[in-house]
């Protein structure tokens, strides 16, 4: 069952709901965090809970079984079904933006490739709700700084269209 905190605008699909493999991660984040890094998975998008659960499993399988990571790299994944999928969550250090930024940021990744199109309005609302939720829960500072993945590493992520979009979000700061 999706859990919805009263302060959150969008429900978060817990790991057991999307049948995640057990995490082997141990490094904790020091909350509240000052940074959020937005990326895209650059793979397939999904627009139903069933297909997004499968996509979250695919990403996690690649990260754990191919790359040898302790879990899916992202703290949260965003589906075009308008739902947020719990990755490492608020408390564990991700593997999304390199060694410099991982320990001091939350990594949220939109499932899909956003070089040539923007995510659905539902996905955008879900991400914005998650960020509001993070502030309300004390996981993010109220003056947190939002960055695109390409602002912190040499990459095309989060894709041209999504990158242009997040540059208009209130907490975005350029490199």
């Amino acid at each position: 069952q999706e859990t919805e905190d009263p302060a959150c605008c969008s429900p978060i699909v817990p790991r057991n709901e999307w049948k995640a493999l057990a995490s082997e991660c141990a490094q904790h984040l020091s909350l509240p965090l000052r940074y959020v890094v937005v990326s895209h998975t650059a793979g397939s998008s999904c627009n139903t809970p069933a297909s997004c659960q499968q996509q979250a499993r695919n990403v996690q399988h690649y990260h754990m079984k191919t790359l040898g990571w302790c879990d899916v790299g992202y703290n949260f994944l965003i589906g075009e079904d308008g739902l947020v999928y719990e990755g490492r969550g608020w408390n564990f250090t991700g593997a999304h933006s390199g060694h410099l930024w991982n320990p001091m940021s939350i990594g949220i990744s939109f499932m899909g490739n956003y070089m040539d199109r923007v995510p659905t309005p539902q996905a955008i609302r879900a991400a914005q709700g998650l960020l509001a939720c993070g502030v309300a829960q004390g996981a993010l500072r109220s003056n947190y700084v939002l960055k695109g993945h390409r602002d912190v590493q040499r990459t095309l992520s989060p894709g041209n269209q999504l990158y242009h979009l997040i540059q208009n979000w209130p907490h975005y700061r350029s490199p």
Epitope: Q27, G98, H99, L100, P103
Partner: antibody, heavy 119, light 106 residues
């Protein structure tokens, strides 16, 4: 919080060897490269070499090949550099630093260890 | 080995003054990193991948350049910016640093 904690100062005689340690907290060294860099008194920075603790792969600057040996122990999240046949020219502060496997910059640095070589 | 030549070696600037430190490269590289070091402390990553600011670095700092010429600029010098700055390149295990620029407060 990410930290690289280095061992204390070493005062040694010419010809001796010394082994310096660098213990990481806040991250797993297996997910990074650990580098060693030195800084002679009033001088610039020189890269010595690095280790990939996930597989013990090492690379060295040619100037330090034979002088430095870098190792790691993932169970204690610690990297080491052993410096051999020390001379006064090796007197310097030695820093460990960490980098992502896919990035080309040193994200975090230890506080440094002074090695002083004198008869 | 790729040689990085920094200039000037030492400079002083007044608060509010614009400061530019340059790093010339003996053969073309794709990006440059910069570290700040204060007396008695270890270096800190300051600017990486030519123009990206490390977390917590004030926005008055910027980095630019390409090929064989790179620079670090402070738009308006502040007291806390007095330090040594080192450029650094890493290309296929030719990792080298510049000799450093000592920036003093005038």
């Amino acid at each position: 919080e990410v930290q690289l904690q280095q061992s204390g100062a070493e005062f040694v005689k010419p010809g001796a060897s010394v082994k310096l340690s660098c213990t990481a907290s806040g991250f797993n060294i297996k997910d990074t490269y650990i580098h060693w860099v030195n800084q002679r008194p009033e001088q610039g920075l020189e890269w010595i070499g690095r280790i990939d603790p996930a597989n013990d792969d090492t690379k060295y600057d040619p100037n330090f090949q034979g002088k430095a040996t870098i190792t790691s122990d993932t169970s204690s999240n610690t990297a080491y550099v052993q410096l051999s046949s020390l001379t006064s020219e090796d007197t310097a502060v030695y820093y460990c630093a960490s980098s992502d496997n896919s990035d080309s910059w040193f994200a975090y640095w230890g506080q440094g260890t002074l090695v002083s070589v004198s008869a | 080995q790729i040689v990085l030549t920094q200039s000037p070696a030492i400079m002083s600037a007044s608060p509010g003054e614009k400061v530019t430190i340059t790093c010339s490269v003996s053969s073309s590289v794709n990006f440059m990193n910069w570290y700040q070091q204060k007396l008695g402390s270890s270096p800190k990553l300051w600017i990486y991948d030519t123009s990206k600011l490390a977390p917590g670095v004030p926005a008055r700092f910027s980095g630019s350049g390409s090929g064989t010429s790179y620079s670090l600029t402070i738009s308006s010098m502040e007291t806390e910016d007095a330090a040594s700055y080192f450029c650094h390149q890493w290309s296929s295990y030719s990792l080298t640093f510049g000799a450093g620029t000592k920036l003093e407060l005038k």
